[in-house]
Interface confidence: low
């Protein structure tokens, strides 16, 4: 079957890294510079992706595979195949339309990306706050107030947190 197919379609013999050149009697021509074909039997080569600006080249383009990009320091990848680079923020911040903003009281972000998330509400699990939360760190929950030895007192629990996913504007 494979032999029959190649007799009917000479392009099927062209390996990855080449294309079937209609202008040259359907012979297999190498992909021109800055282009590639990742599969055999291609009638054209695809143009290599350029890693420009905040994108930097993670893997060079070859005749058989596209270039791969990542982001320069200070940015991180978003989307399939790093289709976007988004600015990093500091821990304790989140990226909004107006740039990096500090987490609101009652929320934290321990990464350079993503949104500020509400502190854990220890009382929902019947526990008390052992260590207060900050913009960079979640609260640490300790034993329930009933479990505390006599005379021990717990830290005041945090104010109700905002809903996750809401950015300060």
């Amino acid at each position: 079957f494979e032999r029959t197919r190649s007799l009917q379609d000479p392009c099927s013999n062209c390996p990855a890294g080449t294309f079937c050149d209609n202008n040259r009697n359907q012979i297999c021509s190498p992909c021109p510079p800055n282009s590639f074909s990742s599969a055999g039997g291609q009638r054209t080569c695809d143009i290599c992706r350029q890693c420009k600006g905040v994108f930097r080249t993670r893997k060079e383009c070859s005749s058989t595979s596209n270039a791969e990009c990542d982001c320069t320091p200070g940015f991180h990848c978003l989307g399939a195949g790093c289709s976007m680079c988004e600015q990093d923020c500091k821990q304790g911040q989140e990226l909004t339309k107006k740039g990096c903003k500090d987490c609101c009281f009652g929320t934290f972000n321990d990464q350079k990306r993503g949104i500020c998330r509400p502190w854990t509400n220890c009382s929902l699990d019947g526990k008390s706050v052992l260590v207060n939360g900050t913009k960079e760190r979640d609260v640490v929950c300790g034993p329930s107030p009933a479990d505390l030895s006599p005379g021990a007192s717990s830290v005041t629990p945090p104010a109700p947190a905002r809903e996750p996913g809401h950015s300060p504007q």
């Epitope: 600006g53 905040v54 976007m84 988004e86 990226l95």
Partner: antibody, heavy 120, light 112 residues
Framework: SVEESGGRLVTPGTPLTLTCTAS????????MIWVRQAPGEGLEWIGD??????TTDYASWAKGRFTISKTSTTVDLKMTSLTTEDTATYFC?????????????????WGQGTLVTVSS | DIVMTQTPASVEAAVGGTVTIKCQAS??????LAWYQQKPGQPPKLLIY???TLESGVPSRFKGSGSGTEFTLTISDLESADAATYYC??????????????FGGGTEVVVK
Amino acid sequence: SVEESGGRLVTPGTPLTLTCTASGFTISSYHMIWVRQAPGEGLEWIGDIYGGTATTDYASWAKGRFTISKTSTTVDLKMTSLTTEDTATYFCARARYSGGSYANYVFNLWGQGTLVTVSS
Amino acid sequence: DIVMTQTPASVEAAVGGTVTIKCQASQSISSYLAWYQQKPGQPPKLLIYRTSTLESGVPSRFKGSGSGTEFTLTISDLESADAATYYCQGYDWSSSNRYDNTFGGGTEVVVK
């Protein structure tokens, strides 16, 4: 703000370097573009540079004859083998990154331009 | 190479009227299209990016639409201050698309 300088009357074949000076922001955080506009004509992209890595890109017609480089506060456009067809106002502009995506950019801060006249 | 084509080259309308400017990309640029306004002796001014997002301070009389290869700028309730040349710009730099000129040829808007 951005301000272009270095435009003047030159004879064909003379090299010329234009300078774009940034104030109020750091070039290393931005993409900068050079665009030119011949008298009575439209805008023509020459090339651009990303200040963070000094990565450059050029229009195909500009490759080889135009070179963009940067310092911490300036972006230079070096032009060689000038002809009368290069007579134009040369603009420098800074990118405004849009929509949370730093993949794509538009330009919201432009200089007033500097006029280059090539004549014998 | 992607080519940006603008039509018409010139359009005339009365104060209070509406003008429509079209911009066509020779292949898809998704929604990555911007519009600029330029008045004589001045640099271009960014009006709209990402097809339809108004730049800060731009009146809502300016409206951008489209996607892929076909884009439109509509200016309604025309004012004499809208007399200018308008340029579209394709900017899908994240892909392998290459532009010899990211800008369209321009459309002159004359307000009577």
